[in-house]
């Protein structure tokens, strides 16, 4: 899978994580920080 950094317009897309652009899948993906989940890392879990 080809990946690159997300475009600058996606700054802030991932609330608690790193945004990665999955080129072949035509979508952005959030790699969440520890303790966070959700498509955009918006949920905190203990």
């Amino acid at each position: 899978v080809s990946i690159t950094k997300c475009n600058s317009d996606m700054n802030g897309y991932c609330l608690h994580g790193q945004c990665i652009y999955l080129v072949d899948m035509s979508q952005n993906y959030c790699r969440c920080e520890v303790g966070y989940t959700g498509v955009r890392c918006e949920h905190f879990y203990l």
């Epitope: 690159t4 475009n7 600058s8 317009d9 996606m10 802030g12 897309y13 609330l15 652009y21 080129v23 035509s26 979508q27 952005n28 498509v39 955009r40 918006e42």
Partner: antibody, heavy 116, light 106 residues
Framework: QDQLVQSGAEVKKPGASVKVSCKAS????????IQWVRQAPGQGLEWMGR????????KRREKFEGRVTITADTSTNTAYMELSSLRSEDTAVYYC?????????WGQGTLVTVSS | DIQMTQSPSSLSASVGDRVTITCKAS??????IAWYQQKPGQAPRLLIQ???TLQPGVPSRFSGSGSGTDYTFTISSLQPEDIATYYC????????FGGGTKVEIK
């Protein structure tokens, strides 16, 4: 399957406002950005602005500042674009477009006609 | 705002010809360019994103290349069903469409 269903065609008088809706099904708009694009008859595509429904923040093209309002209701999974002070050159097909989780998934378009 | 200058605005070519459309950005857009095909009365159809990544179901005669500010879209062998208007879109910093290129058959 994922869908963006827009509201029906509108006819408005100059100076009036129009509010176009864009209802998502099959996915949560909070996971995406919703963009708005328009196309006047026989003309090119023009990006108007977008909303991040999760945060509620918007970005607009400078020429539309003060005239376009983009909102989202996450409880109904619907985005809205309201354009005020309509003039004849606002006659166009208005599209909502999903981006973020999937690159550019388009609604079917809404024709807005401005005529006295 | 980033400006996208697309050329030519229209072209006429024969079936089987190689067709090339260019888009020049007013600043580096880091390969974040997409190409759309639009036929009359239809919504635009995404052909290519991230400069050269073909979308599923799009024929291999369509291709894209470029970097920095200069990008190219190519139809290697024009077919009758390719008659349409083509648009570039930069999506690095917000979004800007090129002015479009109307492709006709000679």
């Amino acid at each position: 399957q994922d869908q963006l269903v827009q509201s029906g065609a509108e006819v408005k008088k100059p100076g009036a406002s129009v509010k176009v809706s864009c209802k998502a099904s099959g996915f949560n708009i909070k996971d995406t950005y919703i963009q708005w694009v328009r196309q006047a008859p026989g003309q090119g595509l023009e990006w108007m602005g977008r909303i991040d429904p999760l945060r509620g923040n918007t970005k607009r093209r400078e020429k539309f500042e003060g005239r376009v309002t983009i909102t989202a209701d996450t409880s109904t999974n619907t985005a809205y674009m309201e354009l005020s002070s309509l003039r004849s050159e606002d006659t166009a097909v208005y599209y909502c477009v999903r981006s973020g989780t999937l690159f550019d998934f388009w609604g079917q378009g809404t024709l807005v006609t401005v005529s006295s | 705002d980033i400006q996208m200058t697309q050329s030519p605005s229209s072209l006429s070519a024969s079936v089987g010809d190689r067709v090339t459309i260019t888009c020049k950005a007013s600043q580096d857009i880091h390969k974040y360019i997409a190409w759309y095909q639009q036929k009359p009365g239809q919504a635009p159809r995404l052909l290519i994103q991230y400069t050269s990544t073909l979308q599923p179901g799009v024929p291999s005669r369509f291709s894209g290349s470029g970097s920095g500010t200069d990008y190219t879209f190519t139809i290697s062998s024009l077919q009758p069903e390719d008659i349409a208007t083509y648009y570039c879109l930069q999506y690095d910093n917000l979004r800007t469409f090129g002015g479009g290129t109307k492709v006709e058959i000679k």
